[in-house]
Interface confidence: medium
């Protein structure tokens, strides 16, 4: 009796399953009871000797490439051996590497978690993923794993993490880079500082008073609101960050508390109040303001 080993598929791709079948075409199955065993190179596979003429291999990898055969024996210990069959496992090169972010869009709040997810549309076997910061490419981390995606995590994002990032994937056919992804770190506004600027030390009625409000930290654009005794005077924007000013032509009614508020969509902050009082210097003919 002759024995044949059949592999299906005969040219598997990495990661795909293969079924090995040990066939005896010239022997009726009722003639004798057989035990089967499958081998690669010099090693027995799976459960060793078994009553099943089939062996299912869930996933084949590049290192599973080799010479396979099977053996069959009757209960009387007669052993039949198949010829060797070469099974070559085909590796798919990595292709279409992409870098995505969590949160999506690459905008992240300072202090929040940022995950850079490197993915390949195709590619099999052990894939080495590498993450780089900046267009010139400061290597941040590398991971080798048998999956189409890998993650690099920045647990608490800082302002200095605002940069372009890219990743590279490689599985033996040369490195394949992703496109650049820009990370924007959004910073809530700090408590603004309100400064009152007058054309002279003792500001007088009809002078123009400049209210300058500035949050020293915060992602632009920043919207500033100006208040006198909790009444809205108006708003000004700082499209590129920094401060903003509001001008006021002084009258006697402008004595009192002034404050300002900054908001960039990540939360509002109110300044401390600044008090402006009228004083009448001795011998003076007109009212003056002091803060």
């Amino acid at each position: 009796a002759e024995l044949f080993l059949i592999a299906s598929p005969s040219h598997p791709t990495e990661g795909s399953p293969v079924t090995l079948t040990c066939k005896m075409p010239f022997l009726q199955s009722s003639d004798a009871q057989f035990q089967f065993c499958f081998f690669r190179d010099t090693r027995a596979l799976g459960p060793g000797w078994s009553s099943s003429p089939k062996l299912q291999i869930a996933a084949m990898w590049k290192e599973d490439t080799g010479s396979y055969w099977c053996e069959a024996q009757t209960m009387a210990s007669k052993v039949l051996r198949s010829r060797r069959s070469q099974i070559n496992v085909h590796r798919v090169p990595v292709a279409d590497v992409s870098l995505e972010t969590q949160p999506p869009g690459g905008q992240v709040m300072e202090g929040d978690r940022l995950v850079l997810i490197c993915s390949v549309a195709m590619g099999t076997g052990d894939i080495t993923f590498l993450w780089y910061k900046g267009a010139v490419g400061l290597n941040l981390q590398s991971k080798t794993q048998r999956s189409l995606t890998a993650e690099y995590e920045i647990p608490s994002v800082r302002e200095s993490d605002a940069e372009q990032y890219y990743c590279v994937a490689e599985n033996g056919y040369g490195p394949s880079p992703s496109g650049l992804v820009s990370i924007t770190v959004r910073i809530p506004v700090s408590r603004p500082i309100l400064m009152l600027r007058a054309p002279r030390a003792q500001a007088a009625v009809e002078d123009v008073l400049e209210l300058h409000c500035e949050a020293l930290r915060g992602s632009p654009p920043i919207l500033y609101w100006f208040y006198h005794e909790d009444i809205t005077l108006g708003s000004r924007s700082a499209p590129s960050g920094g401060g903003a000013s509001f001008n006021l032509s002084l009258t006697e009614e402008h004595s009192g508390n002034y404050s300002c508020e900054a908001n960039n969509g990540l939360g509002a902050q109110r300044s401390e109040a600044v008090t402006l009082n009228f004083t009448v210097p001795t011998g003076a003919r007109s009212n003056h303001l002091t803060s």
Epitope: P221, S235, G265
Partner: antibody, heavy 117, light 108 residues
């Protein structure tokens, strides 16, 4: 008298466009941010878009991003909402509202937009 | 996105009674919360800003309280004209400027 008056609503087929206007009077229009807010029949209020007082910054709700454009003409004291690729779910009363920094203090009477084939 | 949840959805009371409406935020909005009243066929009307400040011309029977995530609108003694829809809105984090789903105050 501080007032906002919307116009431009009507019945339009899905996929078509419409432009809403909001005429402001009684206050210095160029000092205030302006919003569009909508209310579908029998539903709650949904913020749509904002434009800052100087027109330099615009933000949109995710549901309209890429389809709607907010703009303003400070010389004409008018706010606009250009609505493209309209869908049935855009059917609503559209209000313009003034941003007072701490609330929307002045609202228009609203204009009805019906998207139907 | 900050989610505002109003409760109850409907409140049935009689004129003269006290009404308490609640608004809860999914994360802190500091005191940047406004309340609006809306009557059928009309635009919303600002009642309260900064969680507790009455807008110009709003009667003293309307009051707001709370900060952070929990806010309350109280109408001390209901007048017939107070039966309407009430919405809360946060202005701390944007976009979007989110509204609650509304509370309907109806006559019992």
């Amino acid at each position: 008298q501080v007032q906002l008056v919307e116009s431009g609503g009507g019945v339009v087929q899905p996929g078509r466009s419409l432009r809403l206007s909001c005429a402001a009077s009684g206050f210095t229009f160029s000092d205030y941010g302006m919003h569009w807010v909508r209310q579908a029949p029998g539903k709650g209020l949904e913020w749509v878009a904002v434009i800052w007082y100087d027109g330099n910054n615009k933000y949109y709700a995710d549901s309209v991003k890429g389809r709607f454009t907010i703009s303003r003409d400070n010389s004409k004291n008018t706010l606009y909402l250009q609505m493209n690729s309209l869908r049935a779910e855009d059917t609503a009363v559209y209000y313009c509202a003034r941003d007072w920094g701490r609330a929307f203090d002045i609202w228009g009477q609203g204009t009805m937009v019906t998207v139907s084939s | 996105e900050i989610v505002l949840t109003q409760s109850p959805a409907t409140l049935s009371l009689s004129p003269g009674e006290r009404a308490t409406l609640s608004c809860r935020a999914s994360q802190s909005v500091s005191s940047y919360l406004a309340w609006y009243q809306q009557k059928p066929g009309q635009a919303p009307r600002l009642l309260i800003y900064d969680a507790s400040n009455r807008a110009t011309g709003i009667p003293a029977r309307f009051s707001g309280s709370g900060s952070g995530t929990d806010f309350t609108l109280t109408i001390s003694s209901l007048e017939p004209e107070d039966f309407a829809l009430y919405y809360c809105q946060q202005l701390n984090n944007w976009p979007p400027y989110t509204f609650g789903q509304g509370t309907k105050l109806e006559i019992k």
